[in-house]
Interface confidence: medium
Amino acid sequence: AQGKEVVLLDFAAAGGELGWLTHPYGKGWDLMQNIMNDMPIYMYSVCNVMSGDQDNWLRTNWVYRGEAERIFIELKFTVRDCNSFPGGASSCKETFNLYYAESDLDYGTNFQKRLFTKIDTIAPDEITVSSDFEARHVKLNVEERSVGPLTRKGFYLAFQDIGACVALLSVRVYYKKCPELLQSLARFPETIAGSDAPSLATVAGTCVDHAVVPPGGEEPRMHCAVDGEWLVPIGQCLCQAGYEKVEDACQACSPGFFKFEVSESPCLECPEHTLPSPEGATSCECEEGFFRAPQDPMSMPCTRPPSAPHYLTAVGMGAKVELRWTPPQDSGGREDIVYSVTCEQCWPESGECGPCESSVRYSEPPHGLTRTSVTVSDLEPHMNYTFTVEARNGVSGLVTSRSFRTASVSINQTEPPKVRLEGRSTTSLSVSWSIPPPQQSRVWKYEVTYRKKGDSNSYNVRRTEGFSVTLDDLAPDTTYLVQVQALTQEGQGAGSKVHEFQTLSPEGSGSLAV
């Protein structure tokens, strides 16, 4: 922010009324009036260029320092070119000297040169040459100097002429303040600029109404530089919940809007399925039947639990069931839908039912499913199963009701056996198989069917109670198609997949490959 100037002395604004002291009296400096831009202006002028040894002083009135520590002196003046005078005026100068003296009282007309300290020699950037003078072009020079630190009650300035043709049109003395400032929702008080160039006065800011330092943030601070400019802002204030930044203030959220936290963000419109909020709201309450999950942002619409899965099918495949369903028609306004599958089995004979989670196997964990299908295996044959698929979302836990659909299936077959080749020779194949233990008690025998590949006219069948068989009297180096099927009291179980196994060729008869 630009420095604020507090003027202590302004000659140009005084309209010739200040009555400064000239020394020697009646010679040298003289108060004159002129016309510039059709306006009368006053100036202190001296032009004793033809006489040598000039020592003409002009002293200001006593200036009360007040709270100033460093003063700035702005001079506007014109200096005439020494060559514009006939003969060049050999004793003519083109500079003058600026002095100051501090004092605790006004000495009045008692002028003593020895009390004054030189600030600088003031030289013009542009001198007024003959043609400018004739054409009334005033070549105005502006020079600024500063003095500090000042310690006494007041001070004088003095101008020493040593033989120049100079006119002082403006003498302005001021000090600088860092102005009252509102920045980052913090108010910084008007602060007097320090007197030493390297130093920066640290000033604490106070948060405006309804603004606070954010958690973990730094308190607002600024630095007031010598030139009255605020520098190096540190920290900030932010509008508290329910308020937003409007220019340099925090304004309550309008009805129908809310702000949840201390932040830079503006108030947001209440989302869908919320009740209209009052002024200054930090949140918007949900409509009846709608909810907000703990992790939901306040800007998210209120939501409700989903409806049941839209369509559920159970397709039996031996001792397996594939469950498929489609998403709920009403998602409740959320995308975090998951599904849970539960299983119940019933014995047809007794009609007794119970949970079957521990006895069946799911293709993936049955709770928190995101896909819309799952395969259930290790089902017992000749058992009735009921599967329940529940749809849940982030707000389902906030209500007691559940959204589910059920499907029932009867298992009439055992699961197809899993077949392995255990060994082979030129004339035999050793085959084993397995089925899930819960189903084994229902199996009476296993039927092994085999035939040469490519021979569709004849096949052989072997029955056994065990889980393996050796098929011999086979032709060497020949591929056989082998299938295993469980036989139960109720009939045939599901057949295994048809496997191709090859006997060894006579050359390789010395080894038994597993």
């Epitope: 009036q33 002129n34 100036m43 514009s84 007024t128 005033v138 100079v166 006119a167």
Partner: antibody
Framework: EVQLLESGGGLVQPGGSLRLSCAAS????????MAWVRQAPGKGLEWVSR????????HYADSVKGRFTISRDNSKNTLYLQMNSLRAEDTAVYYC?????????????????????WGQGTLVTVSS | DIQMTQSPSSLSASVGDRVTITCRAS??????LAWYQQKPGKAPKLLIY???NLHTGVPSRFSGSGSGTEFSLTISGLQPDDFATYYC?????????FGQGTKVEIK
């Protein structure tokens, strides 16, 4: 020695025109502001017009504005006054006058000038 | 325009007398004032500029003073050559204006 010599005066009818000249010598003409000042018979002095050292700016008294034109030719060291639409009240001795700021020991010139050097004058009579 | 009023309009004096002519401006002109002397049938001559500065070659018996609106020309020890009409002129604004003149005659 500074010399200013006016010419071109005479008798002219109202509404007529006349051109006055002022030949300068003895000084650097192009450094001087030049002016015309007139004096009606038995009356006081009245400033008429001025022209800057390089030919501008020019200023006129309200009584002659729009009718008189001041000009100069620095190569000929001559000042002119073209007078049109002459009236009886323009009857006067017309003096050419000059001012050199170099002799003015002041830091800022007044907006106008005084006159250091004068010619002997030329009489202009406007009568029917 | 600024009006310049001289007084008296004429005066009679003897050789050796001290004569003062005054000139009043209708508004402040600081020290932007000149004095001229004119003899019958002759061109005016510059005496004083900037209220109190003597023009080159002008006898020291002539002096000027004043600032603002009140000015005066003083001849201390009137000489026979000084009987003439004296005019003041302001040059504070572009329309340079003369006073109506003061005629100094032999008593």
């Amino acid at each position: 020695e500074v010399q200013l010599l006016e010419s071109g005066g005479g008798l002219v009818q109202p509404g007529g025109s006349l051109r006055l000249s002022c030949a300068a010598s003895g000084f650097t003409f192009s450094h001087y502001m030049m002016a015309w000042v007139r004096q009606a018979p038995g009356k006081g002095l009245e400033w008429v017009s001025r022209i800057g050292p390089s030919g501008g700016p020019t200023h006129y008294a309200d009584s002659v504005k729009g009718r008189f034109t001041i000009s100069r030719d620095n190569s000929k060291n001559t000042l002119y006054l073209q007078m049109n639409s002459l009236r009886a009240e323009d009857t006067a001795v017309y003096y050419c006058a000059g001012y050199d700021s170099g002799y003015d020991y002041v830091a800022v010139a007044g907006p106008a000038e005084y006159f250091q050097h004068w010619g002997q004058g030329t009489l202009v009579t406007v009568s029917s | 325009d600024i009006q310049m009023t001289q007084s008296p309009s004429s005066l009679s004096a003897s050789v050796g007398d001290r004569v003062t002519i005054t000139c009043r401006a209708s508004q402040s002109i600081s020290t932007w004032l000149a004095w001229y002397q004119q003899k019958p049938g002759k061109a005016p001559k510059l005496l004083i500029y900037k209220a109190s500065n003597l023009h080159t070659g002008v006898p020291s018996r002539f002096s000027g003073s004043g600032s603002g609106t009140e000015f005066s020309l003083t001849i201390s020890g009137l000489q026979p050559d000084d009987f003439a009409t004296y005019y003041c002129q302001q040059y504070n604004v572009y329309s340079r204006t003369f006073g109506q003149g003061t005629k100094v005659e032999i008593k």
